[in-house]
């Protein structure tokens, strides 16, 4: 969490963001609140990127003001326009891509002063993985397959009932890179598992981290998994 | 240069099923927001479908359940699964890119008629 | 949901007059997310304007949009005989995820 405050006391207004990370080919948001003013044609916000000359987008007198906007943004970004008035100067960023990455600034102008607050967005690609029984293979056998990462991820195995093992010498990982050439699809196998068991395929960059559970019975095959964003820190 | 080329669409009678194809050229499906528009006879443009760079989908209420966009990244292709067909689905589907630009580049559509 | 309306439903001008074109929208719409089409019988449609006020590849400068929030206007300074077509606006960003207006015929009076 970064909270920024104005340069001059009393004419200063708490801007706070969070560290977000970006699934490059989604919708991405970056937050940033403000204390929020009574009159939305008195609000302006800025969202500005290091490095970058153009602004990423501005918002002022109750609509969007795009003529200084940079190209690499150019038909991209928007803020919730019904929010403002309550305080929300959050963006929303069409289609992330890798290059989006980088520190933004959230400035904010109201009747009662300026604020502003930087935010570190990360990009990357993260997915759920997917673990079945591999019938094909000579023995019992588990295949884990998450579609899309970037950065490369660990992956490592755990199991319920040998917890603290150390599955690397019974496992495979393979990376292989997808036809846009950045992601790639993450395949792990392993081998000699026993029944009534539940084993996990944790897959973890500096970005996301996945699970994939499944126990396995004589009569049955339950599944689940759940993903977690890893550097949301607020600002 | 940048093109989409729709085929797939017929006559076909209510209830039945069809597979709308759109080969891209000159870009990379996967990297874009890919989508189905389509148009009635003499009505307007109704969007139907998207496929996120992602990977993830989403559509329009009036086919969920019925209709599935998917990708073959590496025929750089689109596809359009339309099950249990209606007579309201007769129009021409098109397939258009997404670039961050709106929708830049548009095939020249596929006719799908609903009707027994 | 969002709803795009587009007004007049039919516009008749002749060559060389100035065209101007409405989409009203059911709540605000991101200025960024606002695009313009041109449609011509029997043709796909055709990109003219994106983020409300940028011109497509290609497109002559007699094209321009502005506008924000909900009111959205295309305007055609001076128009050619190949202008008369069907002119939609479009959203993305809410649900539904993009959504056209229904369109304003532009004919030759």
């Known amino acids: 969490l970064i909270i920024g405050f104005g340069i001059s006391g009393r004419h200063s207004i708490t801007v706070t963001t969070v560290a977000s990370a970006g699934n490059i080919g989604e919708d991405g948001i970056l937050s940033c609140t403000f204390e929020p003013d009574i009159k939305l044609s008195d609000i302006v916000i800025q969202w500005l990127k290091e490095g970058v000359l153009g602004l990423v987008h501005e918002f002022k007198e109750g609509k969007d003001e795009l003529s200084e906007q940079d190209e690499m943004f150019r038909g991209r970004t928007a803020v919730f326009a019904d929010q403002v008035i309550v305080g929300n100067a959050s963006l929303r960023l069409k289609n992330v891509q890798l290059t989006d990455a980088g520190t933004y600034k959230c400035y904010i102008i109201t009747s009662k002063g300026k604020g502003n607050a930087n935010l570190e967005y990360k990009t990357g690609a993260f997915s759920m993985p997917e673990v079945n029984v591999d019938y094909n293979a000579s023995s019992e056998t588990l295949r884990c397959e998450a579609p899309r990462w970037f950065p490369q991820p660990t992956v490592v195995w755990a199991s319920q009932v040998d917890q603290g093992a150390n599955f690397s010498e019974v496992s495979n990982t393979s990376f292989e890179l997808n036809s846009e050439n950045v992601t790639m699809k993450v395949v792990s196998v392993l081998y000699n598992v026993t029944i009534n068991n539940t084993y996990s395929c944790m897959i973890e960059n500096d970005i996301a981290k996945a699970t994939g559970d499944i126990k396995v019975t004589e009569s049955e095959i339950k599944r689940r998994s759940h993903l977690q964003l890893l550097n949301s820190k607020a600002s | 240069e940048v093109q989409l080329v729709e085929s797939g669409g017929g006559l076909i009678q209510p209830g039945g099923s069809l597979r709308l194809s759109c080969a891209a050229s000159?870009?990379?499906?996967?990297?874009?927001?890919m989508n189905w528009v389509r148009q009635a006879p003499g009505k307007g443009l109704e969007w139907v479908s998207v496929?996120?760079?992602?990977?993830?989908?989403d559509c329009a209420d009036s086919v969920k359940g019925r209709f599935t966009i998917s990708r073959d990244n590496s025929k750089n292709t689109l596809y359009l699964q339309m099950n249990s067909l209606r007579a309201e689905d007769t129009a021409v589907y098109y397939c258009?890119?997404?670039?961050?630009?709106?929708?830049?580049?548009w095939g020249q559509g596929t006719t799908v008629t609903v009707s027994s | 949901e969002i709803v795009l309306t587009q007004s007049p439903g039919t516009l008749s001008l002749s060559p060389g007059e100035r065209a101007t074109l409405s989409c009203r929208a059911s709540?605000?719409?991101?200025?960024?997310?606002l695009a313009w089409y041109q449609q011509k019988p029997g043709q796909a449609p055709r990109l003219l304007i994106y983020?409300?006020?940028s011109r497509a590849t290609g497109i002559p400068d007699r094209f321009s949009g502005s506008g924000s929030g909900t009111d959205f206007t295309l305007t055609i300074s001076r128009l050619e005989p190949e202008d008369f077509a069907v002119y939609y606006c479009?959203?993305?960003?809410?649900?539904?995820?993009?959504?056209f207006g229904q369109g304003t015929k532009l004919e030759i009076k």
């Open positions: 258009a890119r997404d670039g961050d630009y709106g929708m830049d580049v």
């Open positions: 983020g409300a006020s």
């Open positions: 496929i996120y760079g992602s990977g993830r989908t």
């Open positions: 479009q959203q993305y960003g809410s649900s539904p995820l993009y959504t």
């Open positions: 000159g870009f990379i499906v996967s990297r874009n927001y």
């Open positions: 709540q605000s719409v991101s200025s960024s997310y």
